[in-house]
């Protein structure tokens, strides 16, 4: 038997993936648990096996179809259940009526590349991955640049309040190694949150020309 409080949080990537985390205070000894997704009007359902990510939390990804297929829309509600094996039967540990487009978390931006680099500035572009066409241009981005001797947490956030898949970083130091990350968020959805940060892109500014005032 399982006691204690539990928290069940899921996000939709806007295409064909629902990622869930279930936290349970009470101990679970070698119990098999899964998340079951049952849409309210679609002729499919899906299950994923919860795997431990820490002492008291488990995670899994519901793969609904091909990565770029639009498996759910704004009209859908999905009943999500955490089911744990108890002997020969399954016990419902948590349940929620999940509105996918109210609980969005997109995939991290991909294909970061340096378009142009100079001594003091760098133009960087990226692409969004597996994002629904429903958003049209209703997306925003946050970016951060890691300077030498600093941590990511110390890096100031640059906000792009529109769907702009590039940035021009200014006032950089010549001949210096930097790293850059970006994340994306749709404007839609009451419980929508930022995507994970992209993989960092390392770049180096050009050295100042000899004899020039820098």
């Amino acid at each position: 038997a399982v006691n204690g409080t539990s928290q069940f949080t899921c996000f939709y990537n806007s295409r064909a993936n629902i990622s869930c985390v279930w936290s349970q205070d009470g101990a679970l000894q070698d119990t098999s648990c899964q998340v079951h997704a049952w849409p309210d009007r679609r002729r499919w359902n899906q299950t994923c096996e919860l795997l431990p990510v820490s002492q008291a939390s488990w995670a899994c990804n519901l793969i609904l179809g091909a990565p770029d297929s639009q498996k759910l829309t704004t009209v859908d509600i999905v009943t999500l259940r955490v089911l744990c094996r108890e002997g020969v039967r399954w016990r419902v540990m948590a349940i929620q009526d999940f509105k996918p487009f109210e609980n969005l978390r997109l995939m991290a931006p991909i294909s970061l590349q340096v378009v142009h680099v100079e001594t003091h500035r760098c133009n960087i572009s990226w692409e969004i991955s597996q994002a629904s066409h429903y958003f049209e241009r209703h997306l925003e981005f946050e970016a951060r640049t890691l300077s030498p001797g600093h941590t990511w947490e110390e890096a100031p956030l640059l906000t792009l309040k529109q769907k702009q898949e590039w940035i021009c970083l200014e006032t950089l130091t010549p001949d210096t190694q930097y790293e850059f990350q970006v994340r994306v968020k749709p404007l839609q959805g009451e419980f929508t949150t930022w995507s994970p940060w992209s993989q960092p892109l390392a770049f180096r500014t050009k050295p100042a020309a000899l004899g020039k005032d820098t």
Partner: antibody
Framework: QVQLVQSGAEVKKPGASVKVSCKAS????????IEWVRQAPGQGLEWMGE????????NHNEKFQGRVTMTRDTSTSTVYMELSSLRSEDTAVYYC?????????WGQGTTVTVSS | DIQMTQSPSSLSASVGDRVTITCKAS??????VAWYQQKPGKAPKSLIY???YRYSGVPSRFSGSGSGTDFTLTISSLQPEDFATYFC?????????FGQGTKLEIK
């Protein structure tokens, strides 16, 4: 087997209201959205709205907002659609239909005639 | 609202013919499209959902295809019972909308 059985034909005067019933059987009533679709004589199909019997959640076509009321009685597995302030252009066959995949099972239709 | 434009509006064909009806959505509806058959005085009958999936009991001569904005219903070899009106339908976003119908008549 899944069945949706609707109430009989109605003749109403302009300005009146009509209430059409749709009794479901052969499946878990609370689980699936029931849609209301109408078809004027010789015309196409027009979606009016939907109700999820389990929760009572409702979505309307804004065209009918304020005139259409959808309710359900879970004890009898029946959904009701009431249309008020009737006018001659509301003369149509009204269908209830279950939404699973698409609109998979349909009632036989209820003819509503609005005439003075 | 999403408009579903069906063509042709009417079509004459013979038993055994291959017939194609098309439907164009005014915006992307992915594969959230269904096709229905309706005979005079009867309720519509479901044929296809999710653009290409046949409901059980629907003959294999009926097939659907398409995604995004362009959709097709094909009847590979017309049977006498197939002469009816056919409607496409999008259920991707509210309000759900239907095509104006294609009346399939005997030549």
């Amino acid at each position: 087997q899944v069945q949706l059985v609707q109430s009989g034909a109605e003749v109403k005067k302009p300005g009146a209201s009509v209430k059409v019933s749709c009794k479901a059987s052969g499946y878990t009533f609370s689980r699936y959205w029931i849609e209301w679709v109408r078809q004027a004589p010789g015309q196409g199909l027009e979606w009016m709205g939907e109700i999820l019997p389990g929760s009572g959640s409702i979505n309307h076509n804004e065209k009918f907002q304020g005139r259409v009321t959808m309710t359900r009685d879970t004890s009898t597995s029946t959904v009701y659609m009431e249309l008020s302030s009737l006018r001659s252009e509301d003369t149509a066959v009204y269908y209830c239909t279950r939404h699973y995949g698409s609109f998979d099972y349909w009632g036989q239709g209820t003819t509503v005639t609005v005439s003075s | 609202d999403i408009q579903m434009t069906q063509s042709p509006s009417s079509l004459s064909a013979s038993v055994g013919d291959r017939v194609t009806i098309t439907c164009k959505a005014s915006q992307n509806v992915d594969t959230d499209v269904a096709w229905y058959q309706q005979k005079p005085g009867k309720a519509p009958k479901s044929l296809i959902y999710s653009a290409s999936y046949r409901y059980s009991g629907v003959p294999s001569r009926f097939s659907g295809s398409g995604s995004g904005t362009d959709f097709t219903l094909t009847i590979s070899s017309l049977q006498p019972e197939d002469f009816a009106t056919y409607f496409c339908h999008q259920y991707s976003s509210y309000p759900f909308t239907f095509g104006q119908g294609t009346k399939l008549e005997i030549k």
